[in-house]
Amino acid sequence: FVRTKIDTTENLLNTEVHSSPVQRWSMQVPAEVSAAAGDAAVLPCTFTHPHRHYDGPLTAIWRAGEPYAGPQVFRCAAARGSELCQTALSLHGRFRLLGNPRRNDLSLRVERLALADDRRYFCRVEFAGDVHDRYESRHGVRLHVTAAPRIINISVLPGPAHAFRALCTTEGEPPPALAWSGPALGNGSAAVPSSGQGHGHLVTAELPALNHDGRYTCTAANSLGRSEASVYLFRFHGASAST
């Protein structure tokens, strides 16, 4: 249920010093990992370093958004000689270290994915014993979260000249296509997303004029599924309209 593509290597491996290969700092991460909302995903990250058999204290860190400055989502620390990296930070309790930093593996597990997790993540390791050194991936791994459409709001609002308009907001990835159907609209009348309303994974479509009483249905669809929701318009003639 998790897809990974294109391995990238940052600052690759070894140089020759007196004909003895010495590892340089490098981090290997895939360009992208794809998983469905609700599932778990693994963000792979392995590294090499020049400090042969380092056994001192270390800290493993993952941050989101941008390298070096992005907010930390996970941090753990391992004491000298220990293979256990004790978690000090796990945002919302959903991030867990899958890899073993002592074996040059910082791979991270993200539980119960949400569309908001769709961003780039950067791994970092810090040595703090006799050796003081650190390294962070520069390009990171993009976590691509997919989701079937979910209509999160459908409403009828007052419009100009005692008319009414309808708004339908959905989320999903790929971004869903929205269509309205209802009285005098025909079957599956497409509604163009309102200008500037495609925000992140949210898509909003407006039906600008509801001219007839009855049921109006918003349908959202993408390659992973479809969802629909309805509103009903009933006007009390001779008084102000209501829904």
Partner: antibody, heavy 122, light 111 residues
């Protein structure tokens, strides 16, 4: 209090079917993975199957793959194990168990049912 | 996959410390820090004592502690008490499918 109450065990002939149920209470059922673990008489524990919080991910032991089906109904706070083509070697005490995490595969089992005996014999 | 290896029995006197071992491979215990320990008294369901190598669930006595070195995980019971007499099983995540493997079990006897 937090508990898992099991039902559905019994004596069944080889080749027949049986369905085990596990009713959960005292915790938010749809936040956690759930599992079935069995223990043959006088033997150790064997993981049978696990299911993630939303049924999006499911796993089985090789010994039951293709014959057993795990499922859950989050609206009813219930876990099920449909056992088909039963064999004598499936005879065991079957436990349902709550996981610590939403995903089943990196899990540990912190709450256990009382167990239900399944005996496969002609 | 094959079960993790545990000694069949370990015994100790009240007040003593004993250590139970659980030996796996570089595909399970050695590769991941997802080892759990369960205590089972006769005729009762297992009880989680340790998860993720060294974490104790609430309600579990601090006399129980877990650790790991290489491909071997350990459960130490300090200040051994009569009620500690039970079977103990380890479990580990494994990179093979299915992802769980239990140990063969150790019977702890309090002399």
């Amino acid at each position: 209090q937090v508990q898992l109450v099991q039902s559905g065990g019994g004596l069944v002939q080889p080749g027949r079917s049986l369905r085990l149920s596990c009713a959960a209470s005292g915790f938010t059922f749809d936040d956690y993975a759930m599992h079935w673990v069995r223990q043959a008489p006088g033997k150790g524990l064997e993981w049978v199957s696990g299911i993630s919080w939303n049924s999006g991910s499911i796993g089985y032991a090789d010994s039951v793959k293709g014959r057993f089906t795990i499922s859950r109904d989050n609206a009813k706070n219930s876990l099920y194990l449909q056992m088909n083509s039963l064999r004598a070697e499936d005879t065991a005490l079957y436990y349902c168990a709550k996981g610590l995490w939403p995903s089943y595969d990196l899990d540990a089992f912190d709450i256990w049912g009382q167990g239900t005996m399944v005996t496969v014999s002609s | 996959q094959s079960a993790l290896t545990q000694p069949a029995s370990v015994s100790g006197s009240p007040g003593q410390s004993i250590t139970l071992s659980c030996t796996g491979t570089s595909s399970d215990v050695g590769a991941y820090n997802f080892v759990s320990w369960y205590q089972q008294h006769p005729g009762t369901a297992p009880k989680l004592m340790i998860y993720e190598v060294s974490n104790r669930p609430s309600g579990v006595s601090d006399r129980f502690s877990g650790s790991k070195s290489g491909n071997t995980a350990s459960l130490t019971i300090s200040g051994l008490q009569a009620e500690d007499e039970a079977d103990y099983y380890c479990s580990s995540y494994t990179s093979t499918i299915p992802p769980f493997v239990f140990g063969t079990g150790t019977k702890v006897t309090v002399l």
